[in-house]
Each structure stands twice: as structure tokens, then as C-alpha cells.
Interface confidence: low
């Protein structure tokens, strides 16, 4: 069956294409200018010689996806720079399966089977090369390149060390079995970024977990930056299609932004869903529940198909600083369902934050503590004050006559009013934990319109400090 | 506006040829594939085949590879298809569409061009 | 080949009255697509990837299916309804079209 795979394989389907190989493997050294003529070709071991091909180093295999215009695209030539220039002694080699991919969705998706066997077989080739090790791979492929990947990994006679599926591709992949996609089980490690995922309409990118780490950006959906708006902003004719391409794009430009600011790295949270990210549950680094993302992954004993989400700025470099809010609002009277808006700005010792929403994703619980993620684009140094503003809201005749009511029985504490002693912080970067105090305990109230200030009073909150993720991924 | 205009009704004999065109606006012709359906009198659609305006590549329906040739003029963005050795059953009306954006259906369709073969 | 089955033929409703036709494949498919298309007009795209509606499709309008059938359903039949509805494939070369399903007013 192979080699009927590797017959069909040696051109395109029709037409002037038919001449061309429909796989090439494009070796781009970086001693000296990129050469056009060096191609690698199974036997063929003298373009590794006059392109010095380096044995012993690393090799990164970068694969593209679907594509409409034909061409390679702008992307691609970005990746090929960033590994070149973090990874110096490294070997990047682009497949290029551009007849194949610029057919109809289904006929590519059809293809990716025999683009990744031809993968194998250039690796199967190379692995009988002295200094060549398949633990020195790095197989990363956008969309429909990341199922290449995981078949060359699968068809390979042994394991590749490092897979990285670059936002891979949803239709016809979606809720298959492990052997028909990209899957951990297709390299020693499998670590995946989602961009574009939707639970309507169709998805681009694949929804389900495929590697042993899931990284979910922003929720692995909207990508700040990619709105309508933004888009028709930065180019002259925006298009849905140019928000798809955006945001399904964001994982190449994560992964570029983790190999060029090697200073700015990002960090993702485990996490079981969106919605709880989003509630700042999630922010802890115990038993490798957080890890780097795009090249500063790492593989962490016993995870598969984990999930992991961060937020992130709208462009390079992508890191943001991410915050976990507990504040326990006690009601002493019953106030009926509310749904304040809250606000808070956090003021450290290198900046301030901008003012920052906090997101109520369900329902304020009274007499309860609530939590809340917030995150900042700019590194605030250390929390030294927090100022909390409830926003305040139009109200009807008839609501103030209650409250003005409400007010002549009980003087002292108006209707719609909380109280709120402390405030808990715990940074997701450092890992560190802080207590905030109001500074009057006698002043604890909170009402519509009002703020509230909070000074750090106590390091932690009673409890051992966690491992911060700077120390665990270095 | 995205827009693709056919040629105008075609009457020919038995055994001769003709070339039906499709010129494309709106868009960027080299980013999509243009394909081929016919449609006989108050019957379905058949679909005949496409081509890559990139670089040429054509894809046909094994029924119509003796009988259809795709071509594309890139300087005025139009796809055309050459219909040879006529007979009554090539009587219908011709489509060209587009394949669509991103992941593909036909979103645009040419407004349709007819060919009668009579002797 | 995949062979497209649509069936009924030709049906007529009511205003107001809810529609059903369908589409079976010869073999399985991975997304079936259908339009519409009025007398001496180009077909248009009505639905793709089996349930999405195509910008302009009233809401009234959904898809359904998956491996060898497929549906097409009007939840309330209105006069603008009354057209030929074809489904489609892509998954396979050659890409068939069913041989559509004829839909009248009562």
C-alpha cells in the first residue's frame, strides 16, 4: 500500500503541475544567502554536503497547510528566520506541498496522508546518516500541516521527538479516530496551540485536545486584534475571511513571538474549561499545572490531551501578566439578584495598570467569595495598592424611591450596597500571593458609583507559596 | 462586488467546437478555483471540472475529459472552457463558479451561458 | 461515482406548513452542501458544511445529517420558498450533485 502511497506521490493530479514534484523538501541553511538548489531528495546525499546539512544539531521540518493563493506565504519565511536566528546551528527544512495543497479543501485533505508519508520516508532516509537522530526533530505544522506532521510521525520506523500542531485544522479532522489526525501518540512530545475554534458555525481549527498539551489562547477563539474592526483598520478591503485568516494564523505568530522574546515569555494555565480560566480559577503552576508556550514548552511527565489557556495582547510580543482576584462581598440585607460592574486598578512598583474590567461570568454569589482573573499588558513590578470601582447605573424613579424608602427604615445602609474587607491576589507569573486590606476596617462599604481603596497588608494569604513557573520552566 | 460574467448563447452545428468564457471581477482571480457545471433542460447539475488560475492545474470529471478543455487568462482574469465535437446531448445551459473562500463550496455562479447544437 | 439520491422528487406545501426533503449518498460523505435555484436563475448557495446557512438564508431555514443522509428542513413554508433545492458533495472526485427536489406551492 506504501508504495502504491509513494507512486501517486511523485506528482500532481493534472495539468502544467503534473511536471513538477509535488513534494519538496527545501533545506534553508543559514550560512550564507538562501540558495534556490538546495533540495533534499531521498538518495540523494549531496545537497546535504553542498548545503551543509549539520548531523548532530537539530532539525526543524516546517510544514504549510491549505492554501488559496499558491504561494508561500509571508508566515512561513517569518517562522524559517525565527528558528534560524534562535536555534543558529540548526537545520530548517520547509515541505513544500504546494500542488497538493492548493487544490480543494477535500482533495488536500485527502493528500495529507501521502505528504506525511513522503515526510517519513525523507526522515527513515536521513536516520541512516551518521549524528542523525530522530530525537533531534521538530516536525511544526500550521492547519493542514499539523496532520501531516502527526502522519509522518506516525509512518515513521521509530519516534520523532517533537511535534507542534500550529492551530491544525478542524473540518474532516474534528471527533476522528487518533490514526486519521495529528495525536500524542505521533512524537515523544506533542504540544498544540488552537486560535481559531468555534462551537458555531464552522470551526477552522480542530476544537479537541490532539497533544499532550492543548494551549488555548484567549480561550482558543476571538484573538484580540482579529475583530472586524481592527482588521478593516490595518488593511484597505477588510473581510470576514481576513478576520479567519487572523486569527487562524495567531498560533504561527504565538510560536514566532516564543523564539524571537525569549524575554517575554508567556505562560499557560491548566485548565478544564474556558469558562473557568476565564473566572481565574486556574492560575497555579503545582504538579506542572502551567507551562510555556509555542518552543518554551516542555514535556511534562504523564499529560495528555491537557488543557491549557492564557491571555495574551493584541500583537508581538504576546505576553501579558495574568492576575487571580478572590473578594468575598458580604450583603447585609437581601438585595435580590445583582449584577454590578466592577473595575479595578492595580498600582505597582514599576506602573499602573490601565482600568480593568472585572468579567462576571456567571453571577455575583453575596456573602460569598468570588474570583476573578485580570491581567495586565504592561509588568506592574510588585502590587503595592488596588483601587475597586463599582460603576455606577441609571436607575428608574421607582428604584431610587425604594432605596429613599429603604433609607428612612435603616438609615445607615442603603439598598444595593456591599462590603468588601480585603482583597486576595495571586500573580500567575511570580506566583506569588498578596493580601490587600481597606484602610478604614470601619470603612468596608461599597455602593453604585463608589470606590474603594486597598493596600497590600500581608505576603500570601496563610498559606505555602507556590512554585513560580519562571522557576519550574527554566 | 464579486462578480462572474458568461458569454452570451451559442447555436451550432453537430461536430463543431466552442470556447464559453467566464471573466471574473471582484476579487483576486489567482486566489480561488474556478469550476465548470452543466446543467441539460430541466435536469440537474453535472459538475465538469476546475482549474487553478495560479498556475493552471485542472481537474476533470472523467466524463468530460474528451470532450471539455479549461483554460485561464490571468492578464484579464477569465477562465474559459472549450466544448469540441458537438452533439444534441452538449444542448445546456454552461456554468462557471467559484470556489470559495477558505475552506470551499461555490459561493458566486456565473449567470449561465446556453448552447443549442442543431443541424 | 457517489451517487446523490433527493427524495421527494417534486412536493408541495402549504404556507406555514413545515418541510422536510432529503438527501441520501451512495457512499459516505464528510459535509453535504445544497442551493437553491429559481426558474431560469443560477443556482444559489443555500447551506454548507451540512448546517450552516449561507449569508441572506432566513433562519427558518437548517440542515442536517451525517455519513449518508442528510436533510434540508423549513420549519414554516413561505411563498419565496417555492424553488429547486440540489445537494451537493465534495468529498469525492468527480463532485455530484443529487438530482434535486422540486418545491411547490399548495
Known amino acids: 500500500a506504501e508504495e502504491q502511497l509513494e507512486g501517486g506521490l511523485r506528482t500532481a493530479k493534472d495539468g502544467p503541475a503534473a511536471a513538477k514534484a509535488a513534494v519538496r523538501f527545501h533545506f534553508r541553511t543559514s550560512k550564507g544567502p538562501e540558495r534556490e538548489g538546495c533540495y533534499l531528495s531521498v538518495g540523494h546525499s549531496q545537497p546535504l554536503e553542498d548545503c551543509s546539512f549539520n548531523m548532530t544539531a537539530k532539525t526543524f521540518f516546517i510544514i504549510h497547510g491549505w492554501t488559496m493563493s499558491g504561494m508561500l506565504e509571508n508566515w512561513l519565511h517569518k517562522l524559517v528566520s525565527a528558528l534560524q536566528m534562535r536555534e543558529k546551528d540548526a537545520n530548517v527544512v520547509v515541505v513544500d506541498w504546494l500542488p497538493l495543497a492548493h487544490q480543494l479543501y477535500t482533495d488536500a485533505v485527502n493528500s495529507t496522508r501521502v505528504v506525511g508519508l513522503s515526510v517519513a520516508k525523507m526522515l527513515d532516509w536521513l536516520q541512516g546518516k551518521d549524528g542523525f537522530s530522530l530525537g533531534n526533530v521538530h516536525l511544526i505544522g500550521y492547519s493542514l500541516g499539523a496532520h501531516v506532521a502527526g502522519f509522518a510521525g506516525n509512518f515513521v520506523k521509530g519516534t520523532v521527538g517533537r511535534i507542534t500542531g500550529l492551530d491544525p485544522a478542524g473540518p474532516m479532522f474534528e471527533g476522528v479516530d487518533i490514526h486519521r489526525r495529528l495525536s500524542p501518540d505521533d512524537a515523544d512530545f506533542v504540544d498544540v496551540l488552537h486560535t481559531y475554534t468555534r462551537s458555531f458555525g464552522i470551526s477552522i481549527g480542530i476544537q479537541m485536545p490532539v497533544g499532550h498539551i492543548d494551549i488555548y489562547p484567549n480561550g482558543g477563539d476571538f484573538q484580540p486584534g482579529c475583530g472586524l474592526n481592527d482588521v478593516l483598520g490595518s488593511i484597505a478591503y477588510g473581510t470576514i475571511a481576513e478576520v479567519v485568516k487572523c486569527e487562524h494564523e495567531r498560533a504561527v505568530h504565538l510560536f514566532v513571538d516564543s523564539l524571537v522574546n525569549q524575554d517575554k515569555p508567556s505562560f499557560a494555565f491548566q485548565c478544564t474549561d474556558s469558562n473557568r480560566f476565564k473566572k481565574g480559577i486556574c492560575l497555579s503552576c503545582r504538579k506542572n499545572r502551567c507551562n510555556g508556550i509555542g518552543y518554551n514548552a516542555k514535556k511534562t511527565r504523564n499529560k495528555r490531551n491537557t488543557k491549557m489557556y492564557l491571555k495574551t495582547r493584541a500583537g508581538m510580543p504576546f505576553r501579558v501578566y495574568h492576575y487571580q482576584m478572590k473578594i468575598h462581598f458580604f450583603s447585609y440585607k437581601s438585595v435580590g439578584a445583582i449584577e454590578p460592574t466592577f473595575y479595578v486598578t492595580l498600582y505597582g512598583t514599576n506602573a499602573e495598570s490601565q482600568v480593568l474590567s472585572l468579567e462576571i461570568v456567571e453571577q455575583i454569589g453575596l456573602n460569598a467569595t468570588n474570583t476573578f482573573l485580570v491581567y495586565t499588558e504592561e509588568d506592574l513590578g510588585d502590587l503595592l495598592k488596588i483601587k475597586l470601582t463599582w460603576e455606577g447605573t441609571s436607575r428608574s424613579w421607582y428604584d431610587l424611591w425604594r432605596e429613599f424608602r429603604s433609607y428612612l427604615s435603616q438609615p445607615h445602609r442603603p439598598e444595593r450596597e456591599l462590603s468588601i474587607r480585603r482583597i486576595r491576589v495571586k500573580s500567575g507569573e511570580t506566583q506569588r500571593r498578596l493580601t490587600f486590606c481597606v484602610e478604614d476596617p470601619e470603612k468596608t462599604s461599597i455602593a453604585p458609583g463608589q470606590e474603594l481603596w486597598f493596600y497590600k497588608c500581608r505576603d500570601g494569604w496563610r498559606m505555602k507559596n507556590e512554585t513560580s513557573p519562571t522557576v519550574e520552566l527554566s | 462586488e464579486v462578480q462572474l460574467q458568461q458569454s452570451g448563447p451559442e447555436l451550432l452545428k453537430p461536430g463543431a467546437s466552442v470556447k464559453i468564457s467566464c471573466k471574473a471581477s471582484?476579487?483576486?482571480?489567482?486566489?480561488?478555483?474556478m469550476h465548470w457545471v452543466k446543467q441539460s433542460h430541466g435536469k440537474s447539475l453535472e459538475w465538469i471540472g476546475s482549474?487553478?488560475?495560479?498556475?493552471?492545474?485542472?481537474s476533470y470529471n472523467e466524463k468530460f475529459k474528451d470532450k471539455a478543455t479549461l483554460t485561464v487568462d490571468k492578464s484579464s482574469n477569465t477562465a474559459y472552457m472549450e466544448f469540441r465535437s458537438l452533439t444534441s446531448e452538449d444542448c445546456a445551459v454552461y456554468y462557471c463558479?467559484?470556489?470559495?473562500?477558505?475552506?470551499?463550496?461555490?459561493?458566486?455562479w456565473g449567470q449561465g451561458t446556453t448552447l443549442t447544437v442543431s443541424s | 461515482e457517489n451517487v446523490l439520491t433527493q427524495s421527494p422528487a417534486i412536493m408541495s406545501a402549504s404556507l406555514g406548513e413545515k418541510v422536510t426533503m432529503s438527501c441520501r449518498a451512495s457512499?459516505?460523505?464528510?459535509?453535504m452542501y445544497w442551493y437553491q435555484q429559481k426558474s431560469d436563475a443560477s443556482p444559489k448557495l443555500w447551506i454548507y458544511?451540512?448546517?450552516n446557512l449561507a449569508p441572506g438564508v432566513p433562519d427558518r431555514f437548517s440542515g442536517s445529517g451525517s455519513g449518508n443522509s442528510y436533510s434540508l428542513t423549513i420549519s414554516s413554508m413561505e411563498g419565496e420558498d417555492a424553488a429547486t433545492y440540489y445537494c451537493?458533495?465534495?468529498?469525492?472526485?468527480?463532485?455530484?450533485f443529487g438530482g434535486g427536489t422540486k418545491l411547490e406551492i399548495k
Open positions: 463558479a467559484r470556489y470559495g473562500n477558505y475552506v470551499g463550496y461555490f459561493d458566486y
Open positions: 471582484g476579487y483576486t482571480f489567482t486566489e480561488y478555483t
Open positions: 482549474i487553478n488560475p495560479y498556475y493552471g492545474g485542472t
Open positions: 457512499s459516505s460523505v464528510h459535509y
Open positions: 458544511y451540512t448546517s
Open positions: 451537493q458533495q465534495f468529498t469525492s472526485s468527480p463532485y455530484t
